[in-house]
């Protein structure tokens, strides 16, 4: 999916009202420098990319961030401020139905919502450019 | 071990600018960002603001927007912090501080005093 | 900004006191909040983060309690050492913010 027609400011709001909460409410417990960052993102549709990369698509060790509450409103978000995006996520979500799996928070999970919580503070800089 | 090396006390006059060097050491200085809170004489703890050495992004808190001016020298891995326009009111303890995403401070530098007096 | 009001400002207390410091919030910080010990000259020193985990080398006499806007610090037995100033942090929103202190002066 192109990011680059969504409403970044609305997504902004989402994420400085509600998402921004869920993330840290998640990363509850851990320490401050327990994670390098190593992901960033060079423009707003180019963060969101990532984000969304991140936050749906399983990874090695981290399976369960889809059904998270950050993620439900990230998704939200983006399928209300993002101009097509619902549909192109119709088919993804039935595949993630069929792989849908008990929810645990691994250490893997944490390392990638802290580097997730990093692309967001990028995307929210007032100065990036859009494209 | 994380070390942060901050330079010596400065005695400045009102109107003139200050500029405080915070040196780091025992991490991957692009992994983490430098935030800098100050303290005035017997009073609370401020953020000043903070600063990404991965790519100079910079955030102020918006009492010091216009005044404060975050800098990094990668070569060195250090960090400057300039404070234009002084007034007696900004005579204070500075500070340099490190954290990840999650923002409370588990690493701090030893400090730096800034008087300004005419 | 989110605002912290720690209680009391000053606190008078003796060796094997326990202790307690309050920390408000203006609104809901969930338990991004941090405590912090200082010394007259030092910088602060961070005891406790996540509202209650203690941070490593933190003696098990000091604990911290408390969600959404309102927060504790208890030091259960007073040592010699523990007199000093106390500071609350929020890092649930930006701009991160500081309660005005607590000084904890012997008796």
């Known amino acids: 999916y192109d990011f680059t027609n969504c409403d970044f400011e609305k997504i902004k709001a989402a994420y400085l009202s509600t998402i921004s909460k869920d993330l840290i409410t998640y990363m509850s417990g851990t320490k401050s420098t327990e994670f390098n960052n190593t992901v960033s993102c060079s423009n707003r549709p180019h963060c969101l990319t990532e984000i969304q990369s991140l936050t749906f698509n399983p990874t090695a060790g981290c399976a369960s961030l889809a059904k998270e509450m950050f993620a439900m409103k990230t998704k939200a978000a983006l399928a209300i401020w993002c101009p097509g995006y619902s549909e192109t996520q119709i088919n993804a979500t039935q595949a993630m139905k069929k792989r849908r799996k008990r929810k645990v928070t691994t250490n893997k999970c944490l390392e990638q919502v802290s580097q997730l919580q990093g692309l967001w503070r990028r995307f929210n800089r007032p100065l990036l450019k859009q494209q | 071990q994380v070390q942060l090396v901050q330079s010596g006390a400065e005695v400045k006059k009102p109107g003139a600018s200050v500029k405080v060097s915070c040196k780091a050491s025992g991490y991957t200085f692009t992994s983490y960002l430098m935030h800098w809170v100050r303290q005035a004489p017997g009073q609370g703890l401020e953020w000043m603001g903070e600063?990404?050495?991965?790519?100079?992004?910079?955030d102020y808190n918006q009492n010091f927007r216009g005044r404060v001016t975050l800098t990094v020298d990668m070569s060195t891995s250090t960090v400057y912090m300039e404070l234009s326009s002084l007034r007696s009111e900004d005579t204070a303890v500075y500070y340099c501080a490190l954290t990840g995403t999650i923002n409370y401070f588990d690493y701090w530098g030893q400090g730096t005093l800034v008087t300004v007096s005419s | 900004d989110i605002q912290l009001t720690q209680s009391p400002s000053f606190l008078s207390a003796s060796v094997g006191d326990r202790v307690t410091i309050t920390c408000k919030a203006s609104q809901d910080v969930v338990t991004a909040v941090a405590w912090y010990q200082q010394k007259p000259g030092k910088a602060p020193k961070l005891l406790i983060y996540w509202a209650s985990m203690r941070h490593t080398g933190v003696p098990s006499r000091f604990s911290g309690s408390g969600s959404g806007t309102e927060f504790t610090l208890t030091i259960s037995s007073l040592q010699p050492e523990d007199f000093a100033t106390y500071f609350c942090?929020?890092?649930?929103?930006?701009?991160?913010?500081f309660g005005q202190g607590t000084k904890l002066e012997i008796k």
């Open positions: 942090q929020q890092y649930s929103s930006f701009t991160f913010t």
């Open positions: 600063i990404d050495p991965s790519d100079s992004y910079t």
